[in-house]
Interface confidence: medium
């Protein structure tokens, strides 16, 4: 049997990188400069994202895909599609509203972003501290105290005396 053919939207033939131009009998026109269409059949092209100020261009806009931004050195991306740039800190610090602050004793941050996290409490796993923690590094847990040879000492850090992730102001 013969299938009834539906009237096809002429715009559906317009590929990515073009738009269906109503002003020109619905022919497919290329996207103007600084605009793109990432899918076919579009009636308009979208304006390209501009990476200005703290944002810098990671990928140029093309007729079929939007520009992609990242952040200028000293900042890192946050949010979908790098919608925001946040100030970096040094390892051993966290970003507060008052700027970069050193991690409190008992906490560490091994990255340029994020918050200070408490050192691992080795004793919770029945282990001892093999290497002490620093502002930049977590403690390294070793064998349990019972496994240590006689005379060996273990260092267990005191529990942090504050809520983790917040530096004193």
């Amino acid at each position: 049997f013969e299938r009834t053919r539906s009237l096809q939207d002429p715009c559906s033939n317009c590929p990515a990188g073009t738009f269906c131009d109503n002003n020109r009998n619905q022919i497919c026109s290329p996207c103007p400069p600084n605009s793109f269409s990432s899918a076919g059949g579009q009636r308009t092209c979208d304006i390209c994202r501009q990476c200005k100020g703290v944002f810098r261009t990671r990928k140029e806009c093309s007729s079929t895909s939007n520009a992609e931004c990242d952040c200028t050195p000293g900042f890192h991306c946050l949010g979908a599609g790098c919608s925001m740039c946040e100030q970096d800190c040094k390892q051993g610090q966290e970003l507060t509203k008052k700027g970069c602050k050193d991690c409190c004793f008992g906490t560490f941050n091994d990255q340029k972003r994020g918050i200070c996290r408490p050192w691992t409490n080795c004793s919770l796993d029945g282990k001892s501290v093999l290497v002490n923690g620093t502002k930049e590094r977590d403690v390294v847990c070793g064998p349990s105290p019972a496994d240590l040879s006689p005379g060996a000492s273990s260092v267990t850090p005191p529990a942090p005396a504050r809520e983790p992730g917040h530096s004193p102001q």
């Epitope: 100020g53 703290v54 944002f55 200028t72 050195p73 000293g74 900042f75 946050l78 919608s83 925001m84 740039c85 946040e86 100030q87 040094k90 970003l95 509203k97 008052k98 700027g99 970069c100 602050k101």
Partner: antibody, heavy 122, light 107 residues
Amino acid sequence: EVQLVQSGAEVKKPGASVKVSCKVSGYTLTELSMHWVRQSPGKGLEWMGSFYPEDGETIYAQKFQGRITMTEDTSADTAYMELSSLRSEDTAVYYCATEGVGVIRGNWFDPWGQGTLVTVSS
Amino acid sequence: DIQMTQSPSSLSASVGDRVTITCRASQSISSYLNWYQQKPGKAPKLLIYAASSLQSGVPSRFSGSGSGTDFTLTISSLQPEDFATYYCQQSYSTPPTFGQGTKVEIK
């Protein structure tokens, strides 16, 4: 493009209060952190305080603690800075400024309002 | 608070000159240093942020360098519209603090 337009010049007597407004256009106030900076005649620039919209926290310079109040009317996209117990040394141009859109705690100032001259004189 | 010291406090130069202004922080501020230009009766204008990043729309004759405690603003070829006062500002910690300014005058 963010634009900031401030209220007009004020003349106040010592002991009085002044409230300076800063109207935002181009973006909504809730998208921007807002800072206030003043400049005394022939002097340099002095940060007074900042408002961060992510969690509504306001930070004031120690020097102005107890005398400064920063508020926002988000429905009108307008920020306010009120300074009380005015003295002659508070005579200055007061600026509102924001950070580049999309910047979290970059703590640089751009763009700025045009400034509001506050004169404190008996 | 972190103190910012600019030098010189004023300088005289001619159109076309290369001009250098320095800014020193009282402690290390990494690269969190910004430069502003201010003309009489106008609000400051951001030129450089994060020590060396040129703000959109600012001419490329302006450049910034430095990290830690010592920073430099350079105008490679001074133009008539560049005669103004320049301020550095640290954004490393609160309170943000400014240098006292450098006035660039016509020789």
